[in-house]
Amino acid sequence: MASMTGWKIHYTSTAQPCPYPMAPPNGHLSPVQAKYILKDSFSIFCEPGYELLQGHLPLKSFAAVCQKDGSWDQPMPSCSIVDCGPPDDLPSGRVEYITGPEVTTYKAVIQYSCEETFYTMKVNDGKYVCEADGFWTSSKGERSPPVCEPVCGLSARTTGGRIYGGQKAKPGDFPWQVLILGGSTAAGALLYDNWVLTAAHAIYEQKHDASSLDIRLGALKRLSPHYTQAWAEAVFIHEGYTHDAGFDNDIALIKLNNKVVINSNITPICLPRKEAESFMRTDDIGTASGWGLTQRGLLARNLMYVDIPIVDHQKCTAAYEKPPYSGGSVTANMLCAGLESGGKDSCRGDSGGALVFLDNETQRWFVGGIVSWGSMNCGEAGQYGVYTKVINYIPWIKNIISNFGGGGSGGGGSAKFVAAWTLKAAAHHHHHH
């Protein structure tokens, strides 16, 4: 029987290779092969300071695969020099291009600086470099721009430490002075460029209607049309303050809805340093300013100030333990100032204003006290003005300012009130200043 032999066919196929890829300038290709056929792939990597782009669009990685029709499934990207783009603007400052005009590419250098006199740079030295990751970065590694913080405690006033009272203030003497209207007349002191420090009792009645507070800065005459208007975004009354039951913790903060522009007539007061108590000892001179009642019993038209000495705490406590002031209302959170002979004092309408002291080391003024309360008859002999002792509240102040933000939002919406409340029976043995 004859054997049948069939055809033996061997199929061989050569996959159509893809065009040989050429790495883009400032990039390299991997893996390098003699040829690339079906399912072979390559990746492109850029040199440091260059980034993968398809047109304007960034890519983190790139790989192309050879398809069966002999074409690559992706077009070749480019390796473009990293461009950090225009640096962020610096409020109250400026930016200078060091490498060259408008040069914002890899390794370019810029220098931020703050407006002289009234602002100082926080965080770093202001020098930033465009790094390979595309971010402007400081020598400390920060990606966000520095901050121009207002210089505090500048005053046109030169003090010789003499005690004299009831003086008219001149422009720039008390640039932190804030006039608060909306209920009764009260005062406050500017902190940074969007906070006002005041007394809790001065704004307590407006606590749920903070947006009604008419806040004026840069004013010298109480009724003058020349002032900078500000409005409250939020009010923070110390949670330990109880209205009409003594004046412990008589402190509040108002957050303004916009930052104010700092100039010679509007400058914040400094908060006390740890060492500040050495400038607030008994007989050290502080200065209180305001538009409160004068000796004639009327609200002052012009901003007035009085230089008064710190009074020994025990002496002050004793003065308010005598009838008709008995009740021991002077606490460790208060300080007293005034003359034993009387005649120089803060008074109604001065409430919330700052009692300021000169820091002899920094030559800047700082807030040591907040006008709080005193005897029914201002400037009474043997009685003293009582002030909230600000140094006891530095953690409280800093906590609120850090938690509730530096910059005013400038947005709409109603002003907020933040605090904890427990009302006690009213006590009337002394008056609000």
Epitope: H56, L57, P58, L59, K60
Partner: antibody, heavy 114, light 107 residues
Framework: DVQLQESGPGLVKPSQSLSLTCTVT?????????WNWIRQFPGNKLEWMGY???????SYNPSLKSRISITRNTSTNQFFLQLNSVTTEDTATYFC???????WGQGTTLTVSS | DIVMTQSQKFMSTSVGDRVSVTCKAS??????VAWFQQKPGQSPKPLIY???YRYSGVPDRFTGSGSGTDFTLTISNVQSEDLAEYFC?????????FGAGTKLELN
């Protein structure tokens, strides 16, 4: 599968701020690509607003630069659009998209009206 | 800004026809052009990127061509589901810009 979903208020008053969220599923926004906001006005004109890249860098349309901010939350895999001081001219359908443009959200319609 | 001009706002076609939608850039954009299809009430659907690369899942009757300033989207053998608005888009230069769109309608 990669999916993008926009969410927002629908109605905003003039001068207020608009905030929109794009929630991405099926792909990490830090892995690659640029994550964009694009809007389409009545009449179908499309406008690219800006993007935030996988690295967190942003790029904005200069016509909006003073009003726009694009941010992200990498832990929730979301990116956000904030547009300040809106006017009736900002009435549009807002889309988020992954670029290369291969994935788009369904869009959210925003009306600016008092 | 680069202007992407789609000179024809409307184009009429019939099922089975071949139609070409054109787009002209005001300056060189290389091959960094994409095409999108949009139907009423829907988001734009990506068709073509880098002038001539089809996105996955896009039927091969859609082809893109051109580079520099002149770009074309060609639909061979038009289907009824292709009746939509088509946008070109450049992503070569900041800011990214779109054409005004060309609506494909039935004859």
């Amino acid at each position: 599968d990669v999916q993008l979903q926009e969410s927002g208020p629908g109605l905003v008053k003039p001068s207020q701020s608009l905030s929109l969220t794009c929630t991405v599923t099926g792909y990490s926004i830090t892995s690659d690509y640029a994550w964009n906001w694009i809007r389409q006005f009545p009449g179908n004109k499309l406008e690219w607003m800006g993007y935030i890249s996988y690295s967190g860098r942003t790029s904005y349309n200069p016509s909006l630069k003073s009003r726009i901010s694009i941010t992200r939350n990498t832990s929730t895999n979301q990116f956000f659009l904030q547009l300040n001081s809106v006017t009736t001219e900002d009435t549009a359908t807002y889309f988020c998209a992954r670029y290369w443009g291969d994935y788009w959200g369904q869009g959210t319609t925003l009306t600016v009206s008092s | 800004d680069i202007v992407m001009t789609q000179s024809q706002k409307f184009m009429s076609t019939s099922v089975g026809d071949r139609v070409s939608v054109t787009c002209k850039a005001s300056q060189n954009v290389g091959s960094n052009v994409a095409w999108f299809q949009q139907k009423p009430g829907q988001s734009p659907k990506p068709l073509i990127y880098s002038a001539s690369y089809r996105y996955s899942g896009v039927p091969d009757r859609f082809t893109g061509s051109g580079s520099g300033t002149d770009f074309t989207l060609t639909i061979s053998n038009v289907q009824s589901e292709d009746l939509a608005e088509y946008f070109c888009h450049q992503y070569n230069t900041y800011p990214l810009t779109f054409g005004a769109g060309t609506k494909l309608e039935l004859n």
